[in-house]
Every structure is written in structure tokens, then in C-alpha cells.
């Protein structure tokens, strides 16, 4: 029971992360300026992955596409890049970890294949959850660094005249939410990865066999086959191991986890 | 390499009017939110007014207002500054400014003219 509430908490929390992720890459507010720092017209500048955008303090936006490939900042094709590959991984994840759910019965599907694939979507969340908390964190970098370029070269040419707009660039709205989701995925992996441990099938290094002491009621014939035993009749002839060890299939069908040798 | 070349200054009367011009060369207008600056002897560089991509969002100083107008054309690359009712006050050296669309993404982040005098006699 606990092993299903890890496993399905694992796989919401790890929905809600990518639905985070998806949501903060086709987001604009990335960065955030103040455009010509002039509270008193309030026009502000937003950049996202996509797009970039001017609004005005009654609420008219102008926006325009990042038309060109080439011309795009290199890191800026790096964080759509991590974004994008996060994405595809957590959906590939989320794809495999329904069929994984343990609540979930398709066909004969065995406990160690729904192990298997609860594993493989935990770590495809994980990867996911990562790449998505890199690029944010890529983009927030860019942010800080380009801002203290500009303030270091805000006094610089002829006779010490200002070359820069002193513009405010703050931390968007999307980083966060990127943070957070890239957080809940990475959790959601966690957890999944945790699940499958409770569902692997605990295995043992040895053929389970049960062994029987020879009694009145077991006779043998000399060619080495069982002839009749006292646990009913031999049809199929089965070879006899170890002189008077009995194969434990003749009863049941696969060994379980409670014979004892 | 992206060059701001400003134009259209000169020596005016009291309530007179001059257009200022700025060309934009090595680089697509469009890609820029252009503004103007002004800065006066013996002052710090102030803000005069800006223009979005489009042309669909400007604003301007509150000195400046309902008598300067900015425009944009973006087949020419060309950004306008018409000045009407001039004042002696408003006497400086006119600088052009193209911001990129990237901000704070890329470096450098915005570009400047060389600047044009405007003299506003009494």
C-alpha cells in the first residue's frame, strides 16, 4: 500500500513539475526591465525564450518574436535548448510511468516490469527536473552577469559620459516558476525511483528446492526416473536431482518467495 | 557593427520647430526599441522619449510632453524626432538610443549616437 501512495504521489507531483516546466518556457516575463528607469510613464520591457515584449502601464502590449536563429544569444539558444530537452524527457517519463502505476493493470504485466519502468521514468524525471532547474538557472546567471557588464562600462569614452541606460533587469516571473516545477519534478523522480524499490520482486541467488526424505513411499527404478511417490502420480516421468530431491514445479507451477530449502 | 547617426539640429527660435533624425545602420531597426536622449552643459544625460518596435507604444518625459513626437520608420531604419514650441530650456546636445530586443541577454545590450546640438535662442 505504501509502495502505491510513493509511486502514484511520485507520478502527480512529477505531472505538476512539467506541467510547471512547459508553462514557464512558453512564458515571457523571464526578465523583467523598467524601461529608461521612468517610474512616472511605467513601460516595461519583458524578454522570455520566444519573445520579447513593451507594455504600458494601461495594460497595451507590443511583442515580437525572436525571428532569426543566428543572431540569437548563444546562451539564450542553451536555455531553450535544456528547456526543450527537459520537456520531451518528462513527457517520455510521464508516458511510461502510467503504464508503471501499480493501481494501473495491463494484460500479465509482471511486478518486475512495472519495477523496471517505474525506475526508468523516476530517472528520466530526475534528468528532467535537472535540466530544467540548469537552464533557469543558466538564464538567471546571463542576467546578473550582462548587468554588472553594463554597470562597468556605464562611464566609459569621451570626457566620462554615461553609454548605458541604467536599466533595472529583475528576475521574471517564469524563473521561479521554472525553479519550483524543475524542483517538483526532481522530487516526483525521487520518489519514483523509491517506488520501484518496494516493487522489485525480492530474488534469490539460488534455485528454490525443496528436499524430502526417502520413505516407504517413494520406490525407484534403476533407470534413475521417479516411478510413484506419495504426493500423487507421476505423469510426466520427471528426472530425479540429488537422489531424492524433488523438483519443486511437479506442484506448483513457479517458486515462491515462502519455500524453504 | 551596429552605428546610430543622428541628424536635423541647428539654431532656432523660442517656439520654433526641428525634426531630428536617426539612422540606424548595420543591424534591423525593428529588432530595437529606440529612444531619445538630451543632455545639457553642465547636466546629467536625461530621458526625452522612446518608441516600441511597432511604433504602437511611445512615451516621453513629462518636460517634453504633447510637444515632442516620435516616430519610426522601419523600411527607411530611420527614427523621427519632431519638436514643436521650443523652449530655451530645452537647448542640448540630442543623443539617439537603440535598445536591444534581447536586454539584459545580450552584450552589448544597447547602442548610442554621436549626438546632434539643438540651440534654442531667446
Known amino acids: 500500500m505504501a509502495v502505491t501512495a510513493c509511486q502514484g504521489l511520485g507520478f502527480v507531483v512529477s505531472l505538476i513539475g512539467i506541467a510547471g516546466i512547459i508553462a514557464a518556457t512558453c512564458m515571457d516575463q523571464w526578465s523583467t526591465q523598467d524601461l529608461y528607469n521612468n517610474p512616472v510613464t511605467a513601460v516595461f520591457n519583458y524578454q522570455g525564450l520566444w519573445r520579447s515584449c513593451v507594455r504600458e502601464s494601461s495594460g497595451f502590449t507590443e511583442c515580437r518574436g525572436y525571428f532569426t536563429l543566428l543572431g540569437l544569444p548563444a546562451m539564450l539558444q542553451a536555455v531553450r535548448a535544456l528547456m526543450i530537452v527537459g520537456i520531451v524527457l518528462g513527457a517520455i517519463g510521464l508516458l511510461v510511468s502510467i503504464f508503471a502505476l501499480k493501481c494501473i493493470r495491463i494484460g500479465s504485466m509482471e511486478d518486475s516490469a512495472k519495477a523496471n519502468m517505474t525506475l526508468t521514468s523516476g530517472i528520466m524525471f530526475i534528468v528532467s527536473g535537472l535540466c530544467a532547474i540548469a537552464g533557469v538557472s543558466v538564464f538567471a546567471n546571463m542576467l546578473v552577469t550582462n548587468f554588472w557588464m553594463s554597470t562597468a562600462n556605464m562611464y566609459t569614452g569621451m570626457g566620462g559620459m554615461v553609454q548605458t541606460v541604467q536599466t533595472r533587469y529583475t528576475f521574471g516571473a517564469a524563473l521561479f516558476v521554472g525553479w519550483v516545477a524543475g524542483g517538483l519534478t526532481l522530487i516526483g523522480g525521487v520518489m519514483m525511483c523509491i517506488a520501484c524499490r518496494g516493487l522489485a520482486p525480492e530474488e534469490t541467488n539460488y534455485k528454490a528446492v525443496s528436499y524430502h526424505a526417502s520413505g516407504h513411499s517413494v520406490a525407484y527404478k534403476p533407470g534413475g526416473f521417479k516411478a510413484s511417490t506419495g504426493f500423487g502420480s507421476n505423469t510426466k516421468n520427471k528426472k530425479i536431482y540429488d537422489g531424492g530431491a524433488r523438483t519443486e514445479d511437479e506442484v506448483q507451477s513457479y517458486p515462491s518467495k515462502h519455500d524453504y530449502v | 557593427q551596429v552605428q546610430l547617426v543622428e541628424s536635423g539640429g541647428g539654431v532656432v527660435q523660442t517656439g520654433g520647430s526641428l525634426r531630428l533624425t536617426c539612422e540606424i545602420s548595420g543591424a534591423a531597426l525593428s529588432s530595437y526599441t529606440m529612444g531619445w536622449f538630451r543632455q545639457a552643459p553642465g547636466k546629467e544625460r536625461e530621458f526625452v522619449a522612446a518608441?516600441?518596435?511597432?511604433?504602437?507604444?511611445?512615451w516621453y518625459a513629462d518636460s517634453v510632453k504633447g510637444r515632442f513626437t516620435i516616430s519610426r520608420d522601419n523600411a527607411k531604419n530611420t527614427v523621427y524626432l519632431q519638436m514643436n514650441s521650443l523652449k530655451p530650456e530645452d537647448t542640448a546636445v540630442y543623443y539617439c538610443?537603440?535598445?536591444?530586443?534581447?536586454?539584459?541577454?545580450?552584450?552589448?545590450?544597447?547602442?548610442w549616437g554621436q549626438g546632434t546640438q539643438v540651440t534654442v535662442s531667446s
Open positions: 518608441i516600441s518596435w511597432g511604433g504602437s507604444i511611445t
Open positions: 538610443h537603440a535598445e536591444g530586443q534581447f536586454g539584459a541577454l545580450s552584450y552589448p545590450k544597447d547602442y
